[in-house]
């Protein structure tokens, strides 16, 4: 019918989203570069060059990561979008003045266990939860 | 003894970071204003400024909020920092042009109930997941 | 007071490699970032690289990748920049400074390279 | 990369009057990481300015940083003798770091 028919442009438009966003996510740039999707970038960080060596006997450092990237419409599969962020996205598109885009934060932690040294001068093993990002998306 | 009131001065100092943070938070802006921390913001959205009138029945727009506001140093409880966020905030301060301090995200999200048309016009009551922000966090 | 002294610099043919040192004093050297930056003669300045306290973190300008090594030796209070594969547009005056969170709160008085057949 | 263009180029005056120094930046520099040296001949770089308008220490406060985005100024709210040297803005925010290419404050 014509109102189902309606419907379907409806979705496939959602209003003027999707040539608005080609443009505006061709153009959102770091570094006069086209800044790349949500995703994982590898980060090695010491803990000297935290100042926490003193007190953390091992490891010296880990494999932290972090979460980078732009969260444009669309959002494809892999940027492990929550529902809201979809919205986000598609307001952000409406209104960019007022309300951002959503962004590329951890989806996955890992924990690390760290020897160091308390407050008494005991060497304690603890495990530390959420220190290494698995994966990213778009929150 | 002079090895524990090191590694104590070694926790409090982490190496530059306290004064460069006092300054760099203090100096973080946004087009002028202090930007303020990261912090749930009120958003209603309506369903006919998306184009999805045609397809969605009820409700006519939900209160989907949003999250934004900076993560700087030092990151309070307040900010549902993970540890990771902790860590990322810390190489930032070292290495600003190349780690971006952490984003302000989603941390508890609600879900609302949709009745929608399908594609063969069928009336559908469907729960969607991760609707609505409750509370922000930097991750 | 905080003082860092280059050496090292001088006239090298192209091809060739230098090893340029910075010398700090004045303040607790294995507490902070340290960076090269060179400046052409009658030019701006322009960032060469720069390493983190341990020596694990370490970024180079796109000029310079794969030629220049920066390292430091925090037990000795010194940076180091080795200079390979050196072309005509390398020839500068190269200061060492010292880094806080992306600003340089002090700078040697420079060392200068030159690079001529 | 970010380009920082500085203006003017050169900036005639006298002791005593009032120095405004533009940069500006080809995109926005993040979280206003910017920061102001001055540089006489044959001498280092001094850092003047941080974080667009945070003094470091020991510069008086007759320099003043400000802005934001794009645009960033260094003000000398009167010119001092010593005050005459070239001034050279330096974002960052975004990789790679990098300088402007110097605005020459001379007297008149």
């Known amino acids: 019918s014509a109102s189902s028919r309606r419907r379907q442009q409806s979705r496939n438009r959602s209003t003027q989203s999707q040539d608005v966003a080609r443009v505006s996510s061709a153009s959102d740039y770091n570094s006069s570069e086209l800044k790349t999707a949500c995703r994982k970038h590898e980060l090695y960080v010491s803990f000297q060059d935290l100042g926490w060596q003193d007190w953390i006997i091992a490891p010296k450092g880990y494999a932290a990561n972090y979460c980078d990237g732009e969260c444009s419409f669309p959002l494809n599969a892999h940027m492990n979008a929550t529902n809201h962020a979809i919205v986000q996205t598609l307001v952000h598109l409406m209104n960019p003045e007022y309300v951002p885009k959503p962004c590329c934060a951890p989806t996955k932690l890992n924990a690390i266990s760290v020897l160091y040294f308390d407050d008494n001068s005991n060497v304690i093993l603890k495990k530390y939860r959420n220190m290494v990002v698995r994966a990213c998306g778009c929150h | 003894s002079a090895s524990s009131r090191r590694r104590q001065q070694s926790r409090n100092r982490s190496t530059q970071s306290q004064d460069v943070a006092r300054v760099s938070s203090a100096s973080d802006y946004n087009s002028s204003e202090l930007k303020t921390a990261c912090r749930k913001h009120e958003l209603y959205v309506s369903f006919q400024d998306l184009g999805w009138q045609d397809w969605i029945i009820a409700p006519k727009g939900y209160a989907a909020n949003y999250c934004d506001g900076e993560c700087s140093f030092p990151l309070n409880a307040h900010m549902n920092a993970t540890n990771h966020a902790i860590v990322q905030t810390l190489v930032h301060l070292m290495n600003p042009e190349y780690v971006p301090k952490p984003c302000c995200a989603p941390t508890k999200l609600n879900a609302i109930s949709v009745l929608y048309f399908d594609d063969n016009s069928n009336v559908i009551l469907k729960k969607y997941r991760n609707m609505v922000v409750r509370a922000c966090g930097c991750h | 007071q905080v003082q860092l002294v280059e050496s090292g610099g001088g006239l090298v043919r192209p091809g060739g490699s230098l090893r340029l040192s910075c010398a700090a004093s004045g303040f607790t050297f294995s507490d902070y970032y340290m960076s090269w930056i060179r400046q052409a003669p009658g030019k701006g300045l322009e960032w060469v690289s720069y390493?983190?306290?341990?020596?694990?973190?370490?970024y180079y300008a796109d000029s310079v990748k794969g030629r220049f090594t920066i390292s430091r030796d925090n037990a000795r209070d010194s940076l180091y920049l080795q200079m390979n594969s050196l072309r005509a547009e390398d020839t500068a005056v190269y200061y060492c400074?010292?880094?806080?969170?992306?600003?340089?709160?002090?700078w040697g008085q420079g060392t200068l390279v030159t690079v001529s057949s | 990369e970010i380009v920082l263009t500085q203006s003017p180029g050169t900036l005639s005056l006298s002791p005593g009057e009032r120095a405004t120094l533009s940069c500006r930046a080809s995109?926005?520099?993040?979280?206003?990481?910017l920061a102001w040296y001055q540089q006489k001949p044959g001498q280092a770089p001094r850092l003047l300015i941080y974080?667009?308008?945070s003094r470091a220490t020991g510069i008086p406060d007759r320099f003043s940083g400000s802005g934001s985005g794009t645009d960033f100024t260094l003000t000398i709210s009167r010119l001092e003798p010593e005050d005459f040297a070239v001034y050279c803005c330096h974002q960052y925010g975004s990789s790679p770091p990098t300088f402007g290419q110097g605005t020459k404050v001379e007297i008149k």
């Open positions: 995109q926005s520099v993040s979280y206003r990481y």
């Open positions: 974080g667009a308008s």
């Open positions: 400074a010292r880094r806080t969170s992306g600003w340089y709160d002090f």
């Open positions: 390493i983190s306290i341990s020596g694990s973190t370490i």
